[in-house]
Interface confidence: medium
């Protein structure tokens, strides 16, 4: 007996071939022996099966001996023994019919976890793997979970069904929605303006829901709501904003939020949330700022960072041109009795310059400035 | 202790500009915000805006946008409210003010006098 | 803008009693467990004074005969006992949304 496997929803066409090659009469039935289609000389005639509607053949081919049945928008139950009677002959063809399905939703959030379900029919026992867009393969049975989606995991899925040594190839478009970076770290002189950017991984068509940045100075005791926001249809609309420091926010896509300057006492860590219209849970990017304030006082010239550096960070006073006369895996670094000219200030992370600060010092009569 | 210093008075016809300035001591300058408040003689107080002395970001009230310029000289530890196409309803005491510790606007400027007069 | 409306427009109190002054907001101006609201005292001639911050917090310095409370919508300022010095406008304002706004005031006279 001839298998053939079908996808729930799609078109499946059984053949069936006469010796002779020419338009003779033939009958498909399926396994209750209740007609589907047939023909009576050139016409198509219908039989009382539930495919009804759904059935069809090519009277193109009848003439070269070919007899199909066309079996449009399968479903599970389609899956049949299929008899074809012609020319005194029965050719069976066994049809089996699967649908893969995606848990509710095709758009998951970072995070959460996917569950492909294989609809089968009874009595059949196929195994499924899939491949992810980054290749990682999955195998399974009726189910298959994937947790803790990621942002790569986003793209056409491949998943292939296979019985009796047949396969069946399903494609599912996934879309992870989450920001393009996990978290971001923004480094900043003391006084400049900063610019905060929060880019999503993906598109759709209409975007809702409401977002908050949560603050947690470096030298403050808790954390802080610094804004919070709506997103109607890709607008941005803000809700409430603190009066300090007061954040500005872009109207459009991507997320896009202005500190009016880097100060010490802003310098930490904050967390952007956004939680989405009919989805549970919501997405997160950290964002981290970094601010460096050089000065001089009476004999004093010094450097510091506030913010969350990392241990490697090495932080340099240096005079221009001239070697390091100081360089620490500190936050704050000095020189006592600096000479006149123009030093600068470093952090750098395995050489590569991060921040920088120029300050001026000037002869020991006059007063510092800073350019 | 913080201090907030201002100009002294000002007479100026319709239609000119003023600038008044206010000097702080006794903290650094760019940390706080500097906010200008206006009191027209015998009336309430209302928000003009406010400056980021260390960007020079400014925020103003709708009702001032068109007329107001607020700006800062970190050099001097200086800010300044400019107000341009002055009318009678301009003649009024302009504050500045920096907060405190909390929401509130702890320090103030002793006041400018402000009178436009034909 | 949040509209902010006290009464009484003025009032007159006797030596050592209590003068309560009321602040009514146009919309909330709560948010994170906090109320946006502060107060100022101001004296002919003179710059406003801070009194409270944050709709009940004393600011340094100021005596603890003034107290602040509400939230929302509704805010309070107590005086009590008054004294001599008190004699003053009082004014409420907001902090929680821009343009930050003030109340008319209310003229506070001791009997």
């Known amino acids: 007996k001839k298998v053939v496997l079908g996808k729930k929803g799609d078109t499946v066409e059984l053949t069936c071939t006469a010796s002779q090659k020419k338009s003779i009469q033939f009958h498909w039935k399926n396994s209750n022996q209740i007609k589907i289609l047939g023909n009576q000389g050139s016409f198509l005639t219908k039989g009382p099966s539930k495919l009804n509607d759904r059935a069809d053949s090519r009277r193109s081919l009848w003439d070269q001996g070919n007899f199909p049945l066309i079996i449009k928008n399968l479903k599970i139950e389609d899956s049949d023994t299929y008899i074809c009677e012609v020319e005194d002959q029965k050719e069976e063809v066994q049809l089996l019919v699967f649908g893969l399905t995606a848990n509710s939703d095709t758009h998951l959030l970072q995070g959460q976890s996917l569950t492909l379900t294989l609809e089968s029919p009874p009595g059949s026992s196929p195994s499924v793997q899939c491949r992810s867009p980054r290749g990682k393969n999955i195998q399974g049975g009726k189910t298959l979970s994937v947790s803790q989606l990621e942002l790569q995991d986003s793209g056409t899925w491949t998943c292939t069904v296979l019985q009796n040594q047949k396969k069946v190839e399903f494609k599912i478009d996934i879309v992870v929605l989450a920001f393009q970076k996990a978290s971001s770290i923004v480094y900043k002189k003391e006084g400049e303006q900063v610019e905060f950017s929060f880019p999503l991984a993906f598109t759709v068509e209409k975007l809702t829901g409401s977002g908050e940045l949560w603050w947690q100075a470096e030298r403050a005791s808790s954390s802080k709501s610094w804004i919070t926001f709506d997103l109607k249809n890709k607008e941005v609309s803000v809700k409430r904003v603190t009066q300090d420091p007061k954040l500005q926010m872009g109207k459009k896509l991507p997320l896009h939020l202005t500190l009016p300057q880097a100060l010490p006492q802003y310098a930490g860590s904050g967390n952007l949330t956004l939680a989405l219209e009919a989805k549970t849970g919501k997405l997160h990017q950290e964002v981290n700022l970094v601010v460096m304030r050089a000065t001089q006082l009476q004999k004093n010239l010094t450097c510091e960072v506030w913010g969350p550096t990392s241990p490697k960070l090495m932080l340099s006073l240096k005079l221009e041109n001239k070697e390091a006369k100081v360089s620490k895996r500190e936050k704050a670094v000095w020189v006592l009795n600096p000479e006149a000219g123009m030093w600068q200030c470093l952090l750098s992370d395995s050489g590569q310059v991060l921040l920088e600060s120029n300050i001026k010092v000037l002869p020991t009569w006059s007063t510092p400035v800073q350019p | 202790q913080v201090q907030l210093v201002q100009s002294g008075p000002e007479l100026k016809k319709p239609g000119a500009s003023v600038k008044v300035s206010c000097k702080a001591s006794?903290?650094?300058?760019?940390?706080?915000?500097i906010h200008w408040v206006k009191q027209a003689t015998g009336q309430g107080l209302e928000w003009i805006g406010e400056?980021?002395?260390?960007?020079?970001?400014?925020y103003s009230n709708a009702k001032f946008k068109d007329r107001v310029t607020m700006t800062a000289d970190k050099s001097s530890n200086t800010a300044y409210m400019e107000l341009s196409s002055l009318t009678s309803d301009d003649t009024a005491v302009y504050f500045c003010?920096?907060?405190?510790?909390?929401?509130?606007?702890?320090?103030w400027g002793q006041g400018t006098l402000v009178t436009v007069s034909s | 803008d949040i509209v902010l409306t006290q009464s009484p427009a003025s009032l007159a109190v006797s030596l050592g009693q209590r003068a309560t002054i009321t602040c009514k907001a146009g919309?909330?101006?709560?948010?994170?467990?906090?109320?946006?609201m502060n107060w100022y005292q101001q004296k002919p001639g003179q710059p406003p004074k801070l009194l409270i911050y944050?709709?009940?917090n004393l600011e340094s310095g100021i005596p603890a005969r003034f107290s602040g409370s509400g939230s929302g919508t509704d805010f309070t300022l107590n005086i009590h006992p008054v004294e001599e010095n008190d004699a003053a406008t009082y004014y409420c304002?907001?902090?929680?949304?821009?343009?930050?706004?003030f109340g008319q005031g209310t003229k506070l006279e001791i009997k």
């Open positions: 304002q907001q902090s929680y949304k821009d343009p930050l706004t």
């Open positions: 944050v709709a009940s």
């Open positions: 919309q909330s101006v709560d948010y994170d467990g906090d109320s946006y």
């Open positions: 400056i980021y002395p260390g960007s020079g970001s400014a």
């Open positions: 003010a920096r907060r405190g510790n909390g929401t509130g606007f702890a320090y």
């Open positions: 006794g903290y650094t300058f760019t940390d706080y915000v």
